[in-house]
């Protein structure tokens, strides 16, 4: 049994340099292990696809808000 | 491992200005947000404004408008906070914290600045 | 300005006691809430963002829960080194802003 887990950590080395539309968008996690170069988000689109973006991108702030406010709406 | 260097305390004269530093290291300032916050003695933490050090963007809280001007040196991953017109009311401890997201996972351990009349 | 209520300003536990904090906001703020622990002389610490999300290295008997304006801090047995202030933050929009802190202290 080892004495710990290794959990395999997510980072984002690169970001898109265009703006995703939001209907595509499906949801989003925040990046900000120190461990990664960069705070980022990955924007998980309706096809599945995993992108990662700058979170000091205007676009990218409103979108996930946007996100936020849809789960929020869906919620009972 | 992230390090936000402050430098301890500061005394300083009532009316005079004062700018204080943040050294970071472990990560890069550009790639993130530098923040401000405020905690006068026994009391709650305040955020002061932040900003983005890859273009020199600042956004305040509009109570520390004119009183407080955040600048940031990429050169040296240092990021500044500057007071100015100081009163009793500045007599504080000032952390800088980094986060883009609005919330703050490192933070500097401060440095208490004191206003003499 | 989104103004953020912390019920108590302090409040006497046991060591093992099951600690609640809530923590109130003015307007909805889509779960952007953290929550920090300050002990004296010390910068505050990371505990919780997203309302949930507890951070690497925080104890598993920390947890976050809430949505809309109403949000709680727990920890279920409390331990000697829980002793300290707890503060809410939301960062929906800026300016962010914080409760007025919550001080656990020993009975």
């Known amino acids: 049994q080892p004495d710990s887990v290794s959990i395999p950590i997510t980072c984002c080395f690169n970001v898109i340099n265009r703006k995703i539309p939001i209907q595509r968008l499906e949801s989003y996690t925040r990046i900000t292990n120190i461990q990664c170069p960069k705070e980022a988000v990955i924007f998980k689109t309706k096809r599945g696809k995993e992108v990662c973006a700058d979170p000091k991108e205007r676009w990218v702030r409103d979108s996930m808000k946007h996100l936020d406010q849809i789960f929020q709406n869906l919620k009972p | 491992e992230v390090q936000l260097q402050q430098s301890g305390a500061e005394l300083v004269k009532a009316g005079a200005s004062v700018k204080l530093s943040c050294p970071a290291s472990?990560?890069?300032?550009?790639?993130?947000?530098m923040h401000w916050v405020k905690q006068r003695p026994e009391q709650g933490l305040e955020w002061i404004g932040r900003i983005d050090p890859a273009n020199g963007n600042t956004k305040f809280d509009p109570k520390f408008q004119g009183k407080a001007t955040i600048t940031a040196d990429t050169s040296s991953n240092t990021a500044y906070l500057q007071l100015s017109s100081l009163t009793s009311e500045d007599t504080a401890v000032y952390y800088c914290?980094?986060?883009?997201?609005?919330?703050?996972?490192?933070w500097g351990q401060g440095t208490t600045l004191t206003v003499s009349s | 300005d989104i103004q953020m209520t912390q019920s108590s300003s302090s409040f006497s536990v046991s060591l093992g006691d099951r600690v609640t904090i809530t923590c109130k906001a003015t307007?909805?703020?889509?779960?952007?809430l953290a929550w920090y622990q300050q002990k004296p002389g010390s910068a505050p610490r990371l505990l919780i963002s997203?309302?949930?999300s507890l951070e690497t290295g925080v104890p598993s008997r920390f947890s976050g829960s809430g949505s809309g304006k109403d949000y709680t801090l727990s920890i279920t047995s409390l331990q000697t080194e829980d002793v300290a202030t707890y503060y809410c933050?939301?960062?929906?929009?800026?300016?962010?802003?914080f409760g007025g802190g919550t001080k656990l202290e020993i009975k």
């Open positions: 914290a980094r986060g883009v997201f609005g919330f703050f996972d490192y």
């Open positions: 472990g990560l890069n300032i550009k790639d993130t947000y």
């Open positions: 307007e909805d703020i889509y779960n952007r």
């Open positions: 997203g309302a949930t």
């Open positions: 933050q939301q960062f929906w929009s800026a300016p962010y802003t």
